[in-house]
C-alpha cells in the first residue's frame, strides 16, 4: 500500500527548484552601467536557493528554462525627470561566458519612474546575468521597489 | 531498498500547487486604501486553489516561496489625469499578522494608467496580503485590466 | 529492476511542463490587428515545448492553469509619439474556439513605449491565444523587447 503510494512520487531534488530573489546593493562606478545585487535572509526577504552571486552578479547553477523577472524604480524621479534624462534604459542579459553574451530583456523608462517585466529563457550552468542601467538616474534601494529574480521552470 | 528509496520522494499533493487569481470586487470605504478582491469559477476566470479570501484579502495556507503578481488599471484615466492626480501608488504587502507586516511590492502610476509587476517572496501559512491603492483615482473592475494572483513555487 | 525503480517516480511528461516563449514575426495586414509570432531554437532563444503555432498564433495542447506573460515595445517611439498615437492598446485573449473567446489581458501604452504584464488563467487544449495591437504604431522585432509566452502551472 505504502509502496503503491510511492509510485506517484518524485525525487525532490530532481524538481530542480533553483530560485533567487535579490535586492539592490549598489550601482557600479562610472563607465560601469551594471547594478550590483545582494541576497540572503539576513538582508530581509531576498534569498538564493541554487544560483549564486559573483561580485554582485547572478550566476546560474543548473541548466534549464528560467523565468527571469525584474523591477527597477528610479530614486529621485518624476515623469518630468524621467523624460529629461531620457534615454534611461535597463537591460538584463547574459554577460559571461562571453561566447553566450546576449541581451534577454530591455526596457526604457520614457516618462515613467518604474519598469517591471519578466520572460522565459533558457539558461545554462555558469551563465552570469548582468543588469545594465544606462543614464544618470539612480535606482531606489527599497526592497519593494527594486528587485531581480529567477525561477527554474523546467529542464 | 526500494522502500528506502521511495522515502526520498514526494507525494504529488505535497508539491503544493497552491495558486490563486483574483478579480477586483470593490475599493474600500474612505480612509481604507485597500482593494477588495473576489475569486471563483462562478465569477469568470478567477480561482483559489489553496489560498482563501478573508474579507476580500488573500490569506495564504501553505508555507513557501510564492510568485506574487498584480496588474491594476485606473478606470477613467489618461496620461494627463494620471499626472494631475499624482501620486497614485499601489503597494502589495503582508498586512497580518501584524508582526510580519511588510511592503512587498510598490509601484507609482506617474503618467501611466496601468501598473503591472511580479516578484518572488517567502510567505507563511496565515499571512494575509493586502493591496493598497493610494490616491483618488478609481481602479477598473474589468477582469482583463485589474487582477491579483499568487503561485506557490517551492518550499 | 530499472523498470521497478521508474515506477516510483512521476513521469516527467505527466508534470505537464508545457511552456513556450515566442518572438515577433510580423504584424498582420491592414484590418488585422493580430501580432504573428514565431518560435524555435533556430530563431534564437524562443521555443515551444507542448504548445504549437497555428498561422502565427499560439495553440494550447494541455488543459491547466497557465502563467501567460507578454512584453511589447513600440519600434519608433518616444513619449510624444506614444501620446500622439493614443490609444495604442495590446490585448491578449482566447480567439478560438469562438465559444471560449475572451480577453485575458489588456494594456494601453499612454505615454510609454513598452507594456509588460503577466497573469494566471485556465486554458484548455485547443484554445488559441491571439495578441491584438490596435493603433498605427509598429512593434519592435528585437527579441529582448517584444516576446510572448506561456507556462503551465498546475492542472
Amino acid at each position: 500500500q505504502r509502496f503503491a503510494q510511492a509510485q506517484q512520487q518524485l525525487p525532490l531534488e530532481s524538481l530542480g527548484w533553483d530560485v533567487a530573489e535579490l535586492q539592490l546593493n549598489h550601482t557600479g562606478p562610472q563607465q560601469d552601467p551594471r547594478l550590483y545585487w545582494q541576497g540572503g535572509p539576513a538582508l530581509g526577504r531576498s534569498f538564493l536557493h541554487g544560483p549564486e552571486l559573483d561580485k554582485g552578479q547572478l550566476r546560474i547553477h543548473r541548466d534549464g528554462i528560467y523565468m527571469v523577472h525584474i523591477q527597477v524604480t528610479l530614486a529621485i524621479c518624476s515623469s518630468t525627470t524621467a523624460s529629461r534624462h531620457h534615454p534611461t534604459t535597463l537591460a538584463v542579459g547574459i554577460c559571461s561566458p562571453a561566447s553566450r553574451s546576449i541581451s534577454l530583456l530591455r526596457l526604457s523608462f520614457h516618462q515613467g519612474c518604474t519598469i517591471a517585466s519578466q520572460r522565459l529563457t533558457p539558461l545554462a550552468r555558469g551563465d552570469t546575468l548582468c543588469t545594465n542601467l544606462t543614464g544618470t538616474l539612480l535606482p531606489s534601494r527599497n526592497t519593494d521597489e527594486t528587485f531581480f529574480g529567477v525561477q527554474w521552470v523546467r529542464p | 531498498q526500494r522502500f528506502a528509496q521511495a522515502q526520498q520522494q514526494l507525494p504529488l499533493e505535497s508539491l503544493g500547487w497552491d495558486v490563486a487569481e483574483l478579480q477586483l470586487n470593490h475599493t474600500g470605504p474612505q480612509q481604507d486604501p485597500r482593494l477588495y478582491w473576489q475569486g471563483g469559477p462562478a465569477l469568470g476566470r478567477s480561482f483559489l486553489h489553496g489560498p482563501e479570501l478573508d474579507k476580500g484579502q488573500l490569506r495564504i495556507h501553505r508555507d513557501g516561496i510564492y510568485m506574487v503578481h498584480i496588474q491594476v488599471t485606473l478606470a477613467i484615466c489618461s496620461s494627463t489625469t494620471a499626472s494631475r492626480h499624482h501620486p497614485t501608488t499601489l503597494a502589495v504587502g503582508i498586512c497580518s499578522p501584524a508582526s510580519r507586516s511588510i511592503s512587498l511590492l510598490r509601484l507609482s502610476f506617474h503618467q501611466g494608467c496601468t501598473i503591472a509587476s511580479q516578484r518572488l517572496t517567502p510567505l507563511a501559512r496565515g499571512d494575509t496580503l493586502c493591496t493598497n491603492l493610494t490616491g483618488t483615482l478609481l481602479p477598473s473592475r474589468n477582469t482583463d485590466e485589474t487582477f491579483f494572483g499568487v503561485q506557490w513555487v517551492r518550499p | 529492476q530499472r523498470f521497478a525503480q521508474a515506477q516510483q517516480q512521476l513521469p516527467l511528461e505527466s508534470l505537464g511542463w508545457d511552456v513556450a516563449e515566442l518572438q515577433l514575426n510580423h504584424t498582420g495586414p491592414q484590418q488585422d490587428p493580430r501580432l504573428y509570432w514565431q518560435g524555435g531554437p533556430a530563431l534564437g532563444r524562443s521555443f515551444l515545448h507542448g504548445p504549437e503555432l497555428d498561422k502565427g498564433q499560439l495553440r494550447i495542447h494541455r488543459d491547466g492553469i497557465y502563467m501567460v506573460h507578454i512584453q511589447v515595445t513600440l519600434a519608433i517611439c518616444s513619449s510624444t509619439t506614444a501620446s500622439r498615437h493614443h490609444p495604442t492598446t495590446l490585448a491578449v485573449g482566447i480567439c478560438s474556439p469562438a465559444s471560449r473567446s475572451i480577453s485575458l489581458l489588456r494594456l494601453s501604452f499612454h505615454q510609454g513605449c513598452t507594456i509588460a504584464s503577466q497573469r494566471l488563467t485556465p486554458l484548455a487544449r485547443g484554445d488559441t491565444l491571439c495578441t491584438n495591437l490596435t493603433g498605427t504604431l509598429l512593434p519592435s522585432r528585437n527579441t529582448d523587447e517584444t516576446f510572448f509566452g506561456v507556462q503551465w502551472v498546475r492542472p
Partner: antibody
C-alpha cells in the same frame, strides 16, 4: 542635434587594412538607445550595410563581409571605428557612419561620408 | 539575406508630375520598410519609415504604401528640390539591405 564625422586615410593599398573612425557629437554612445553602423556606397552603386556596434561592444556584421570586418567602440571618446582587412579595388567606396534606433533599423543620422580608394 | 529590388532604375519627370517608385522585397517583411532620398555628394536622408509614416520635416507630398512585399513611394507633385536618387531599405532582419536606387531626373 546629433552629428557624426568620419575620419581616416582616403587611400589604402590592396591587401592592407582600411581603418576609419566615426566621432559622435550631440549624443552619447553610452546612453544605449542606438546602434552605430557603417554603410558604404561604391561609386554609382548600391548602399551596403557593413555592420553595427552597440555601446556594450556587441556587434552584428553583414555576412558578406564578416570574415574581414571588425567594428569597435570607445565610449570614453564617444567614437566607434571600422577595420576592413585584405582590401581590394572592390572595396573602393564612400564610407558612411550612421545611427539607427535600437528598436528599429532606421538610419536617421549620417556622417557626410568619406571616399576611400583602394589602389597601389 | 533579403533582396530589395527597385524599379525603375531611373525616370525623367517634370515639375508638378505625380511620380511613383516601386520596391519589391524577396520575402515578406510586413511594415518594416523605409524610403530615403540622396542628393549628389550628400548622405541619404529619411523620408518614410514603417512603410507609410512621414519623417518629421518631410513635405506631405511624399507618401508610402505597401503590402508586405511590394512597396511604393509616391510624390504627388514633383518639386525642383525632389530631383535626387531614392533608396528603399528593409528593417525586418539583419543584414539590413537597401535597394539600388531610382534616379529621378528632370525631363
Amino acid at each position: 542635434q546629433v552629428q557624426l564625422q568620419e575620419s581616416g586615410p582616403g587611400l589604402v593599398k590592396p591587401s592592407q587594412t582600411l581603418s576609419l573612425t566615426c566621432t559622435v557629437s550631440g549624443d552619447s554612445i553610452i546612453s544605449g538607445g542606438y546602434y552605430w553602423s557603417w554603410i558604404r556606397q561604391p561609386p554609382g552603386k548600391c548602399l551596403e550595410w557593413i555592420g553595427y556596434i552597440f555601446y556594450s561592444g556587441s556587434t552584428d556584421y553583414n555576412p558578406s563581409l564578416k570574415s574581414r570586418v571588425t567594428i569597435s567602440v570607445d565610449t570614453s571618446k564617444n567614437q566607434f571605428s571600422l577595420k576592413l582587412s585584405s582590401v581590394t579595388a572592390a572595396d573602393t567606396a564612400v564610407y558612411y557612419c550612421a545611427r539607427s534606433g535600437y528598436s528599429y533599423a532606421l538610419f536617421d543620422a549620417w556622417g557626410q561620408g568619406t571616399l576611400v580608394t583602394v589602389s597601389s | 539575406d533579403i533582396q530589395m529590388t527597385q524599379s525603375p532604375s531611373s525616370l525623367s519627370a517634370s515639375v508638378g508630375d505625380r511620380v511613383t517608385i516601386s520596391c519589391r522585397a524577396s520575402q515578406f517583411i510586413g511594415r518594416y520598410f523605409n524610403w530615403y532620398q540622396q542628393k549628389p555628394g550628400k548622405a541619404p536622408k529619411v523620408l518614410i519609415y514603417a512603410e507609410s509614416s512621414l519623417q518629421s520635416g518631410v513635405p506631405s507630398r511624399f507618401s508610402g504604401s505597401g503590402s508586405g512585399t511590394e512597396f511604393t513611394l509616391t510624390i504627388s507633385s514633383l518639386q525642383p528640390e525632389d530631383f535626387a536618387t531614392y533608396y528603399c531599405q528593409q528593417s525586418y532582419s539583419t543584414p539590413w539591405t537597401f535597394g539600388c536606387g531610382t534616379k529621378v531626373e528632370i525631363k
